[in-house]
Structures are given as C-alpha cells and as structure tokens.
Amino acid sequence: DAHKSEVAHRFKDLGEENFKALVLIAFAQYLQQCPFEDHVKLVNEVTEFAKTCVADESAENCDKSLHTLFGDKLCTVATLRETYGEMADCCAKQEPERNECFLQHKDDNPNLPRLVRPEVDVMCTAFHDNEETFLKKYLYEIARRHPYFYAPELLFFAKRYKAAFTECCQAADKAACLLPKLDELRDEGKASSAKQRLKCASLQKFGERAFKAWAVARLSQRFPKAEFAEVSKLVTDLTKVHTECCHGDLLECADDRADLAKYICENQDSISSKLKECCEKPLLEKSHCIAEVENDEMPADLPSLAADFVESKDVCKNYAEAKDVFLGMFLYEYARRHPDYSVVLLLRLAKTYETTLEKCCAAADPHECYAKVFDEFKPLVEEPQNLIKQNCELFEQLGEYKFQNALLVRYTKKVPQVSTPTLVEVSRNLGKVGSKCCKHPEAKRMPCAEDYLSVVLNQLCVLHEKTPVSDRVTKCCTESLVNRRPCFSALEVDETYVPKEFNAETFTFHADICTLSEKERQIKKQTALVELVKHKPKATKEQLKAVMDDFAAFVEKCCKADDKETCFAEEGKKLVAASQAALGL
C-alpha cells in the first residue's frame, strides 16, 4: 500500500511522541559521537518537516524516502569529517548506497566514557526539572552505545525508566526504591542489546534464510499447536521487522512490529494458549510480553517424524519440489516436539538432514541411503548435553566468580591474541551461563545455555571483527552461525602463540582498588589473570590458582593497611617477584 508521503504515513501511524523518540534513536545509532543537543536539534527539524507533510502530503520533498530525508539531515552535521573521518565519505553517495555506508560505520565498541550514575537526589531533581529532556537523554545514551538496540524495545525500556523515577522520586527512601530498578533495567538492557545484535549479525552476515530458519525453530518451540502455515506467516512478518530495524529503518520496524502484535492477538486461538495476558496489555508491554512468552503445551498426540521424513517413498520428490518448504516443515515438526533442545541444535539437525538428502536423492537407492539419517543426530544431540552437564557441575563446584576465572583461562589459551578487555568481558558473560541456566531442570538447560552462549559468542565475533587479530576467531565466527559454539569449544591451546613480554607495570596496583565495587575489583583481578596467561600460556591451573590466591591476599592486606599506597608499592614488588618465580618467568 503505497503512500504519497512515507514520512507523513509513519508520523500518523506512530504518533508524535514515538516518532520523535525513534528518530532520535536512529540518529544516535548512526552518529554515535554527536552531542545530545545536536541530535535534539536534528530531530526537531525532522519532526517539524513531518508535520508539514501530514498537513499536505504533496508539499515539497514529502515524497522522498525516509533514507533520503534522514541521510540528508545527518549529512548537514558540520563536524562530520573531523568527528567521524571516513564516514563523511558516505555523504557523497546516493541512496541506497549512502545508508549502507552509514550502517557499515556503526561501531559496536564506541570510544565513549562509561556512564556514571549520579546521586539519586541529583537524578530526581533532573527528572522533575525537565522530564522530557531527561528521558530523551536516556534514549540517546543507550542508543549511541548500542547501535543495534531493538528500537521499539528501547521505547519499552524508556517507559519503565520513566515509571521507576515517577514512583521512586516520591518515595521515603528514594535510593532503596530506585537503585534496584535501575540495576534491573541496566542488566536487562545489556541482555536485550546482545540478543538483538545476534539477530542483526544473522541477517547481515548469513542472510535472510539463516534468520528465517532460526525463527521457524524458535516459533515452533513457542507455538507448537500452531499450524505450519501460521508459523510461516509469523516468520515472514518477524523477518521483515528485524530486517528493518537492523537496517536502520526504525519507523517502519516499530510500525510493523505493532501490526504483528495486533495480528498475533487477533489470531491467538490458532497460535498459542499462553498469549491471553500479553494481549490485554498496552502496545509496548504487549509486544515485549509476546516476545518473551513461555512455550505453549505440545499437542497431545504427535506422531514419529520417521513416517514423513524417512519412511515415505516421496521424501526426495517432496524435497525436490520445494526444498526450503520441505526443510522448513522438517524444522517445524522437529522443533515443536523438542522444546528441550537449543535452537542452534535444531538448526544443526536440519542442516544434517538437508546434507543427507542432497547426497541421497542423487544416489541409486535414495531410501536405502537416507534410511538411517536419524542415527547421525545422536552425537549432535549428546555433545551439547554432555558439555552442559560438565560445565554445570564445574559451576556448582566453583561458584560464579571462580567459574568465570576457569573460562578466562580456557579462552585466553584458545585465543590469546584477543585483547584483554574483550577476553574479560566475554568470559565473564560466558560464566554467567551458570547462574542463569544451571538452576533449571534438565529439559530447560540446553535451550537456556546454548542459545545464551550463541549470544555471548556473537559479542566476541562483532568485537573481533572491528580489529581482527586471530584467524581462529575469524574462522569460528564466519564459517557457520550454528556451529560457532562447537567451533570455539573444539579449540585447543594455541601452540603458535608467542608469549607476551613480561611488563611489571601490568601488575602494579594502587590504593584506588580498595574503593572499587566488588564487581570492579573482580574485573581488575580477572584482567591480571588474563595477562598472566598471556605471559605464561603453559601455566598449570595450580600455578595460576596459587598466584591468584596470593594476589587476593595482597589486595586484602593493603586495603586494610594504614598507609595503603606504600603497602601496594612495597608488597606489590614482592608479589610480582614471587609470581615470576612461581610461574618460571
């Protein structure tokens, strides 16, 4: 349904408030270094222009595409060349190349200062003084640090952010009310950002087919009572939504997401019995709720897949007639029967089935050739099961911090070329799989753990892509989306790595460590651990444990000392010498 003016269409559909918020997010995700005030000015100009188009869709420039309008606006920024360097070259291009160019310059790890949370009274005053600016600032700061954040979901976060301040700034104990809510929003926000980053990587690096396969598997697990045709329709619509958001088309994305939520709620009887509560909520909450809804119960009676996918004489005929539809049906039927499998495992099984059919349907006796295809599934199923069992046992034995340390050592030995901050960040997140998933019963562990690991390893992949330093990381990240985790799991110690030169400065600590939060202190210690492994990759677990225990004792001792700085200087030298001796450096 073509509209004379796309910008007027979206303004009317979304309303002024959402329109302005989404344009701000879009601009902040593209120009991540620009000051807040500049973005607000650009957004106001676009909004005023949109209003003229609403009044008269035939007015000058109202027929231009959103990419053209937004791109032209971004290219008016005076400091583009000095702030962004070669990104300014994008402005010499025509659409759609210009937008592609902007997308390529999105930075997953922008050089921005860490967000420091002010005192609660300071925040509440700012909130009361100018609520609108306060909330816009939130959108801006999140969007520029997370350039692939799912924009309609960020509107939902902003709504919760506003609700937290509205409630807590009136409370007797503002801090006790507000801080836990802000912590929760921060943690959920990071998780949401990382999940969306994987969706965008899937679409951009592996194509629409890969994303659709993921969506078929996940939606079939979630809606096992829905017919294949219904799941296929939802997959098509969901793919459009995420393609738009990942492509920077945030207005279209938010509009289409709202339409999809409306469709799902209007057709919930043929989709899932679990949607009732979600569908009673307002739009932003409704969409979020649907995205997180629990799996529906499986239909009472589902036959073995063998009849249709192995024993039928028509397997090759059905496959040849419509390969992707047949494979989609296989994936749908398998996934709705296996909510206990990770999506990536289901995709590996479907890939194995596809490979088998490709080979066997060209053979002399196809049926004989593919008759035992499900025997090939057994090792694929058992590998993640065993890995999760072993790692959950290790987690239960060590606790989260020490489990993270075990992973830090493991991954530093696998890919020692990767930067220390990245190794620390990724290994800490990998280690969180323990507290996140090991508490679940067996039937929920694999989907929780392996699909979470896919999200975390994607963080490693996107950070590494910015500055590639390891062929092994590049190989695991680019060869197969669904085999990334098995690829990293299979990596052994990198024997080609030349140990890093010892630098005493790396292991010099000061009294400021004493005032850090427990989390920050852990990160300091984990940074030192990674550096130790980079200096001595062949160090045993026992050696590393001894050095880390000494290090923890040293920090504790000096933080209790009267003259902390002197203690850190003198005891630090002794610790470095003792550590070198212990590790044979």
């Epitope: 009472a300 009676d301 073995s304 063998a306 029967r337 206990d340 057994k378």
Partner: nanobody, 124 residues
Framework: EVQLVESGGGVVQPGGSLRLSCAAS????????MGWFRQAPGKEREFVAA????????YYADSVKGRFTISRDNSKNTVYLQMNSLRPEDTALYYC?????????????????WGQGTLVTVSS
C-alpha cells in the same frame, strides 16, 4: 522422576504369545511417549515399538510389524506389549522407556527414563 517396572516376561515356545506390562510411578505417563526396546545377549539394544502420548499413533520396528501390538492405559499409568507368533530371535531382555520429548520414536537417546528389563526366552 518416573520409575518404570516391567513384568510379564518368561519362557515360551516358538509361535506362542506373551503380554508384557510396564507400570510407571512417580509421574503420570500421559505426557510421555512410551517405547519398548530389547537387547539380545551380545547384541546392541534395539527399538521394538512405541506409542504416542494419548495412544493415537503407534510405531514398530520392521522385524515385529504385524506380530506385536503396543497399547497404553493412561488411567492405570501402564503400557503393554502384546507379542504374538514369537520366534527364537525375539529372545532378549525387554526394556520399557519413557520420553518427555520425542521426534524419532525409534531413537534410544530420545527417552529419559528406563526400566530394569524383563527377560523373554523363546525356545522349544
């Protein structure tokens, strides 16, 4: 946790019949695909028959099709295997199994709980 106990095994002549039962406790079996497997001395465990959650679908190994019938009574939390026209090659330890989630009824890795087995000997 589901505990499974098989019964009904014994010695029978070729051409004879036996009915195996598998009684479940600890959980209701209506949410499980139920299967029978067997293991002959010195051989690998092999699939015999399976039945879907409410009994609407049954599935058999080629070697027992037309001779064996699997059935279930969810109200009694019990699964049965009626074995007719028994042959010496049916001699084995017969195991009952329960699978919460199962796409391939014939695959042992898709079953979560197993009984201890009941011995069937077909001999003249």
């Amino acid at each position: 946790e589901v505990q499974l106990v098989e019964s009904g095994g014994g010695v029978v002549q070729p051409g004879g019949s036996l009915r195996l039962s598998c009684a479940a406790s600890g959980s209701t079996i209506s949410s499980y695909v139920m299967g029978w497997f067997r293991q002959a001395p010195g051989k690998e465990r092999e699939f015999v028959a399976a039945i879907s959650r409410s009994g609407g679908y049954t599935y058999y190994a080629d070697s027992v099709k037309g001779r064996f019938t699997i059935s279930r009574d969810n109200s009694k939390n019990t699964v049965y295997l009626q074995m007719n026209s028994l042959r010496p090659e049916d001699t084995a330890l017969y195991y009952c199994a329960a699978g919460r989630y199962s796409a391939w009824y014939s695959q042992s890795y898709e079953y979560d709980y197993w009984g201890q087995g009941t011995l069937v000997t077909v001999s003249s």
